[in-house]
Interface confidence: low
């Protein structure tokens, strides 16, 4: 009598997560009588996948009817494959007994699960940085298999080269994760810029996944200040303007000081947006030129986005003509007693 053989023709089968897998197994003889069982893995810790004789296996069906006497095909169909199903599957013949006695195992079929990577998530720095500084962005994607994966970084469509990528774990696993950190040097024009992390994998059929982050969340463009004065129609008044230019983000607090003493504080409101995404703002004071005796220094002090204040000072210029318009009895505050004392626009 010919010795019974258990034949698993495929050494490996690869399927995409969510699909079904067919694992083939035939035996060369139906004698002796006894069940066929499928296991994942070998040795004492193996996991029972399908038992012809008993049990409930909702995701597993036999390809052919195993109850037919002349059927020597014990191939199975596993539906809705997940990465956790990866492993080596063995078709095993038992001889009926109490307990059943294992007679022969097939050589095993390695089931590899191709799982799509999750949508890449790009995270930026926790604190803003100023132009010319380097910031790091991290891209993570999980749950893919096989391990082979390609990750690229782009800034405004241009590929970046300064990044480091790791795929974990290093050894074999049912699924893998990728983490990449890119270093980006900020420029003043980066408020509207975007970084893109692009992940290509065999399961994506040439249509890579992308994750994005806006540099507007990572950049702080400090303002430039300019203080100047202009005459007004009323000959004893001048307009002193603080022009705050090219800053980002919007959060800005402006304080006017008269000879070092706080006279007025404003929060930036009606801002003008520049094409590059930065903002401009101006604040102005009406100054009574007759009220001063000695030189008056007006300082525009700006605290931007919680950073240390920057300031620009202006010595009030009063012409001889303006001085002539003031009577000897004039007295009072330097700032014109208008309400409000200052304005913005």
């Amino acid at each position: 009598e010919e010795e019974l053989q258990v034949i698993q023709p495929e050494k490996s089968v690869s399927v995409t997560a969510g699909e079904s897998a067919t694992l083939n197994c035939t035996v060369t003889s139906l004698i002796p009588v006894g069940p066929i069982q499928w296991f994942r893995g070998a040795g004492p810790g193996r996991e029972l996948i399908y038992n012809l004789k008993e049990g409930h296996f909702p995701r597993v069906t036999t390809v052919l009817d195993p109850t037919k006497r002349n059927n020597m095909d014990f191939s199975i169909h596993i539906s809705n494959i997940t990465p956790a199903d990866a492993g080596t599957y063995y078709c095993v013949k038992f001889r009926k007994g109490s307990p059943d006695v294992e007679l022969k195992s097939g050589a095993g079929t390695e089931l590899s699960v191709r799982a799509k990577p999750s949508a890449p998530v790009v995270s930026g720095p926790t604190a803003r940085a100023t132009p010319e500084h380097t910031v790091s962005f991290t891209c993570e994607s999980h749950g893919f298999s096989p391990r082979d994966i390609t990750l690229k970084w782009f800034k405004n469509g241009n590929e970046l080269s300064d990044f480091q990528t790791n795929v974990d774990p290093a050894g074999k696993s049912v699924s893998y994760s990728i983490r990449s950190t890119a270093r980006v040097v900020l420029t003043r024009r980066d408020v509207h810029s975007q970084v893109i992390c692009e992940v290509a994998h065999v399961t994506l059929q040439g249509d890579p996944l992308r994750g994005t982050a806006n540099l507007s969340e990572a950049i702080r463009v400090p303002p430039t200040l300019e203080v100047f004065q202009r005459p007004m129609r009323a000959e004893n008044q001048v307009n002193v303007t603080c022009q705050v230019r090219k800053f980002y983000p919007q959060r800005l607090l402006l304080t006017w000081l008269e000879n070092g003493n706080v006279s007025q504080t404003e929060t930036a409101s009606t801002l003008t947006e520049n094409k590059d995404g930065t903002y401009n703002w101006r604040s102005w004071l009406l100054v009574n030129t007759c009220a001063h005796r000695d030189g008056v220094v007006l300082t525009c002090q700006v605290e931007h986005d919680g950073q240390p204040a920057v300031s620009k000072s202006h010595a009030l210029e009063v012409s001889a003509h303006q001085k002539e318009q003031c009577s000897d009895t004039t007295s009072g505050p330097v700032l014109a007693p208008t309400a409000p004392l200052g304005g913005s626009g």
């Epitope: 070998a42 096989p146 391990r147 082979d148 990528t165 795929v167 290093a170 050894g171 074999k172």
Partner: antibody, heavy 118, light 107 residues
């Protein structure tokens, strides 16, 4: 035919540098984890470094910071840049391909001899 | 690092003999164990992966077994071309490590 051919070995003084190359044919190198393994004369095999398909790199402790593994997909080639070489680095260096699913070594090059001596 | 210990370090046998080489890992490596054959002046040749799977073209007289920490390589009937040095290797985690080798010599 699947083949790996190493080159770039030779005699170098301690502290010197050498760059080993491994030309792959018959398969796409970037689709596999690739490794360097070395063997000092009369000694056993020692794993040195690996580069994964995503460009991730790994090194044995004794070469960390001195050796750099890289690959050039356009040339289907693997490299090992060896700096600050020591006498203990003297060995035959083999380029090895890892298996597609579990990284089990399957294809070996013929090896290239590196001698570090003054 | 995972240590791999082979025994014996050397072994004398005759043509036709059945020989077994053992390899022990310092921690569980599942079945991520490979066996290699090396002849003098030649590059190693891959024989077995995942403890028991034969590489393509490797004759069936070679067999591997084991899981966890203890593994064996068996050559069922030695032929003259089988006299060589055999190495085991774990590849479950970096750094990959080899056993010190077992030199199989003709008695």
């Amino acid at each position: 035919e699947v083949q790996l051919v190493e080159s770039g070995g030779g005699l170098v003084q301690p502290g010197g540098s050498l760059r080993l190359s491994c030309a792959a044919s018959g398969f796409t190198l970037s689709s596999y984890d690739m490794h360097w393994v070395r063997q000092a004369t009369g000694k056993g095999l020692e794993w040195v470094s690996a580069i994964g398909t995503a460009g991730d790199t790994y090194y044995t402790g004794s070469v960390k910071g001195r050796f750099t593994i890289s690959r050039e997909n356009a040339k289907n080639s693997l490299y090992l840049q060896m700096n600050s070489l020591r006498a203990a680095d003297t060995a035959v260096y083999y380029c090895v391909r890892g298996g597609v699913w579990d990284d089990a070594f399957d294809i070996w090059g013929q090896g290239t001899m590196v001698t570090v001596s003054s | 690092d995972i240590q791999m210990t082979q025994s014996p370090s050397s072994l004398s046998a005759s043509v036709g003999d059945r020989v077994t080489i053992t390899c022990r890992a310092s921690q569980d490596i599942n079945n991520y164990l490979a066996w290699f054959q090396q002849k003098p002046g030649k590059a190693p040749k891959s024989l077995i992966y995942t403890a028991s799977s034969l590489h393509s073209g490797v004759p069936s007289k070679f067999s591997g077994s084991g899981s966890g920490t203890d593994f064996t390589l068996t050559i069922s009937s030695l032929q003259p071309e089988d006299f060589a040095t055999y190495y085991c290797q774990q590849y479950v985690s970096y750094p990959y490590t080899f056993g010190q080798g077992t030199k199989l010599e003709i008695k």
